[in-house]
C-alpha cells in the first residue's frame, strides 16, 4: 500500500527544516507540522509522511523527481520522490540528483569534461523512447548545471532548468532541449489537459513566471475546447 511504501523506514536525526513560509500569529495559517525528507525514495516527516502529488518533474523540488511511488503503480498516483544519488539506477535524467545524469540506466557524475556531443546524444536517447519512464509517461529531462562553467543563455543546449540563467527554463526544441525564456504576463502558454501530454510537444514552452498562472484567455471562453487560448495571467 502507499502508506507502507512511504512510511516503512523511520529516519533518525532529521536535519533542521528547510526555510519556508511559516504562518504569522493571528493569520489563517499555521506553520507546517512536518517537512518532507527523503529516505531512499521513501518520504518521512517529523510526525508522519506528507506525499506531494505531481504530474511532472517541474512540480517537484530540484532534488526530486515525479513518479509513482510503487513499481507499476496507479499512474494517477504520482508524488515527488527523492532524487537518486551517483551509481543508483535510473530511467531518465530527472531521477538523478543535481551534478549527475542518467547514462545507460545508472546515475553518473556530470563533470566538466563531458563533450557536448555526448550530452546531445544523451538528450536524443532520452527522447527517442518516450516510454522509458517508471510509469509510461515521458518526463522533462534534466541535467545539472555543473556541466557548464556558466549558466546557459537563451538558445543554449540544456538538460534541466537549473542549467539555464535566471529567467530561462530548459524546454524541448525539436529533438534536443534549449534554454528558453520563462513566460511573461499575457504570453501564450500551454495548459496540459492530461498528464504526460507535454511529451508530445516538439516546441515546448516554458512555464509562466512567478505570480502568474496559465489560464484560458477571457475572450476565448466561448471557443471550443480544442481551440481555447491559454495565457499567463495574474490572479
Amino acid at each position: 500500500t502507499l502508506n507502507s511504501v512511504l512510511n516503512s523506514n523511520a529516519i533518525k536525526n532529521l536535519p533542521p527544516p528547510l526555510g519556508g513560509a511559516a504562518g504569522h500569529p493571528g493569520s489563517a495559517v499555521s506553520a507546517a507540522p512536518g517537512i518532507l525528507y527523503p529516505g531512499g525514495n521513501k518520504y518521512q516527516t517529523i510526525d508522519n509522511y506528507q506525499p506531494y502529488p505531481c504530474a511532472e518533474d517541474e512540480e517537484c523540488g530540484t532534488d526530486e523527481y515525479c513518479a509513482s511511488p510503487t513499481r507499476g503503480g496507479d499512474a494517477g498516483v504520482q508524488i515527488c520522490l527523492a532524487c537518486r544519488k551517483r551509481r543508483k539506477r535510473c530511467m531518465r535524467h530527472a531521477m538523478c540528483c543535481p551534478g549527475n545524469y542518467c547514462k545507460n540506466g545508472i546515475c553518473v557524475s556530470s563533470d566538466q569534461n563531458h563533450f557536448r556531443g555526448e550530452i546531445e546524444e544523451t538528450i536524443t536517447e532520452s527522447f527517442g523512447n518516450d516510454h522509458s519512464t517508471l510509469d509510461g509517461y515521458s518526463r522533462r529531462t534534466t541535467l545539472s548545471s555543473k556541466m557548464y562553467h556558466t549558466k546557459g543563455q537563451e538558445g543554449s543546449v540544456c538538460l534541466r532548468s537549473s542549467d539555464c540563467a535566471s529567467g530561462l527554463c530548459c524546454a524541448r526544441h525539436f529533438w534536443s532541449k534549449i534554454c528558453k525564456p520563462v513566460l511573461k504576463e499575457g504570453q501564450v502558454c500551454t495548459k496540459h489537459r492530461r498528464k504526460g501530454s507535454h511529451g508530445l510537444e516538439i516546441f515546448q514552452r516554458c512555464y509562466c513566471g512567478e505570480g502568474l498562472s496559465c489560464r484560458i484567455q477571457k475572450d476565448h471562453h466561448q471557443a471550443s475546447n480544442s481551440s481555447r487560448l491559454h495565457t499567463c495571467q495574474r490572479h
Epitope: 507546517a32 506531494y52 502529488p53 512540480e59 537549473s162 505570480g211
Partner: nanobody, 125 residues
Framework: QVQLVESGGGVVQAGDSLSLSCAAS????????MGWFRQAPGKEREFVAA????????VYADSVKGRFTISRDNAKNTVYLQMNSLKPEDTAVYYC??????????????????WGQGTQVTVSS
Amino acid sequence: QVQLVESGGGVVQAGDSLSLSCAASGRTFSSYAMGWFRQAPGKEREFVAAISWSGGSTVYADSVKGRFTISRDNAKNTVYLQMNSLKPEDTAVYYCAAGNGGRTYGHSRARYDYWGQGTQVTVSS
C-alpha cells in the same frame, strides 16, 4: 503569503456524507499542490488526501481510499474534500494545506508551507 480557511465541518451520523471546502486567498493558488490532513484528539496530525496543482495527480491515505475524494477549482481558488461513508474513526479536526513546490521557485524539496486553522468533523455512531 497564502491564507487558507476551511469550512463545512459538523456533526454527522456514521454512514453519512460531508463536504469540506478550503478557500485560499493570495497569489498563484493554481501553482500549489493542496492537501487535507486531520488530527484526532491525542493523536498526531495525519495525511488524508492531496492533489497536484493541475489536478492531474491525486493521492489518498489507505484509510480513506474509495470513500473520500479530493478536487480543486483553480478559478475559485478552492479545494474540496468530499467525504462519504463516514466512520466514527474519521472524527478529527481537518486541516487544509498548500504545498509550495517546484523547480520554478528553486526549492530543493516540495513541501506544505501553509496551513489553515482547521474545521471540526464529528461522526457519531
